[in-house]
Interface confidence: medium
């Protein structure tokens, strides 16, 4: 806590300017009016204050706005934002995308900090949903942002926002997240023609059900192995050898290299060996000829 001391004669700050960097902490506290600081926050970023001096400036703003800073001040916080705690940020009401961008800029090049996470949470909750412009902004700064959300949080993403999502934004998403995002993507891209549709939907296919994969196999899409390996195992298992061959097109040869990995391994175990042999890839582990296959899951469903 900085002691309350009188401002020395002639040192009262009339504006936020560079002379203040020569002020000691107690002089800043005593000689800078908080209201003046609030109205000239945009100048603070242009002055190389030390971290200790920024602490004093933050303290002055905290005293002036105990209930939380107004957006006019928040927008110009600059490096002072790094001094804010999540508790400070929870008091804010940030509604402008420009304010959000300005603060994300300050943290650019760093991992998402607890302050940033809190800021984003406040902003999204204030908006009610993760709209396209917000998602555009957040994924530009943090490509992994989407995959950091829970399936429940992702459910508030409107299908129209899916257009802002780039393939790299989904790199760290797990199947539960893709399960939520895939139907939204399907809806968003539904009016596109075959090849364009596949390009857009490809990175979301980790959430696709069997029937959609079967439909894609009829469209000459030539899915690459990397995409195939990210498909849900339960969605791949019911596919026939012919359907997988059509789905992968020329990439079908890649199955040999992946035969020990899921979902290829589990799929092979479900296929008749003579069907696998038609691929000419030497895939082994299928059901020997003459064996009867009982689909127990279907039996359970009927009972």
């Amino acid at each position: 806590e900085v002691e309350k001391t009188a401002c020395p004669s002639g040192k009262k700050a009339r504006e936020i300017d560079e002379s203040l960097i020569f002020y000691k902490k107690w002089e800043l506290e005593a000689c800078v009016d908080a209201a003046l600081l609030a109205t000239q926050m945009d100048r603070v970023n242009a002055i190389p204050f030390t971290y200790e001096q920024l602490d004093v400036l933050k303290h002055k703003l905290d005293e002036l706005y105990p209930q939380g800073y107004p957006e006019s001040v928040i927008q110009h916080l600059g490096y002072l934002f790094l001094k804010m705690s999540p508790e400070d940020i929870r008091k804010w009401n940030v509604t402008s995308l420009e304010t959000l961008k300005a603060l994300l800029e300050v943290n650019k090049g760093h991992e998402m900090s607890p302050q940033v996470a809190t800021l984003i949470d406040r902003f999204v909750k204030g908006r009610g949903q993760l709209d396209k412009d917000t998602l555009d902004t957040l994924t530009a700064f943090y490509p992994g942002y989407l995959c950091s959300l829970s399936p429940e949080e992702l459910s508030s993403v409107p299908p129209s926002s899916i257009w802002a999502v780039r393939p790299q934004d989904l790199d760290t998403c797990d199947p539960r997240q893709l399960d939520v995002l895939y139907p939204k993507a399907r809806l968003a891209f539904q009016n596109m023609n075959g090849s364009e549709y596949f390009v857009k939907i490809q990175s979301f296919l980790g959430g696709a059900p069997t029937e959609d994969l079967k439909a894609l196999s009829q469209q000459n899409v030539s899915m690459d192995l990397a995409t195939f390996m990210k498909l849900r195992t339960d969605a791949v298992l019911p596919l026939t050898v012919a359907e997988v061959q059509k789905l992968l097109g020329p990439h079908v040869e890649g199955l040999k290299a992946e035969e020990r990995h899921r979902p290829v391994r589990d799929w092979i175990l479900r296929q008749r060996q003579d069907d696998l042999d038609t691929l000419g890839l030497g895939l082994q582990g299928g059901i020997p000829n003459g064996y009867l296959v009982l689909d127990l899951s279907m039996q359970e469903a009927l009972s």
């Epitope: 504006e15 300017d17 560079e18 002379s19 970023n45 242009a46 002055i47 190389p48 300050v106 650019k108």
Partner: antibody
Amino acid sequence: QVQLVQSGAEVKKPGSSVKVSCKASGGTFSNYTISWVRQAPGQGLEWMGNIIPAFGYANYAQKFQGRVTITADESTSTAYMELSSLRSEDTAVYYCARKFTFDVWGQGTLVTVSS
Amino acid sequence: DIALTQPASVSGSPGQSITISCTGTSSDLGGYSYVSWYQQHPGKAPKLMIYNVNNRPSGVSNRFSGSKSGNTASLTISGLQAEDEADYYCSSYDYVSSDTVFGGGTKLTVL
């Protein structure tokens, strides 16, 4: 709109001194830094030192310590840079610039050191 | 003394994006550092393009942006235009010595 206007070109002999002026107009002078930066022909920028006129205290780059003197006259809103013991490698364009951000620059003063 | 290293030259075609790096040591560009970028056309005084890592002065196109990661600051110019051809300098303010140091400069050529 703040403007910085510098004095004219100078030709000096090795071993002598040169004093370049920088007059500010159209804005606050006293509470903002005035820095001096030089640029030798075909070379990069080199910071020499700065002063906040209201404080009168100047800060110099180690390389120029003892050879450069930066002063300011608040009454005329003018800053000065004096460089002594000139040598041929001091031939350069000398700029004054305002604030720590160098947001406004003077037009530059060419100082030629030649025997 | 702090030293900032920039590539001597970079080039790009109109419409492209280019990035100029400025690398220092942990003492000058690590943590909280005060990095600025300047553009200089031949025979002209330098012009401030970015200050305090990523702030743009009014009047500077939003095609110019700054960032910093670890000990490296970067200036990115998107939608490259012929008039962007110039020399670019980074600078850093050292809190310990109160000195400012410039990088060696990068010549940008627009092909």
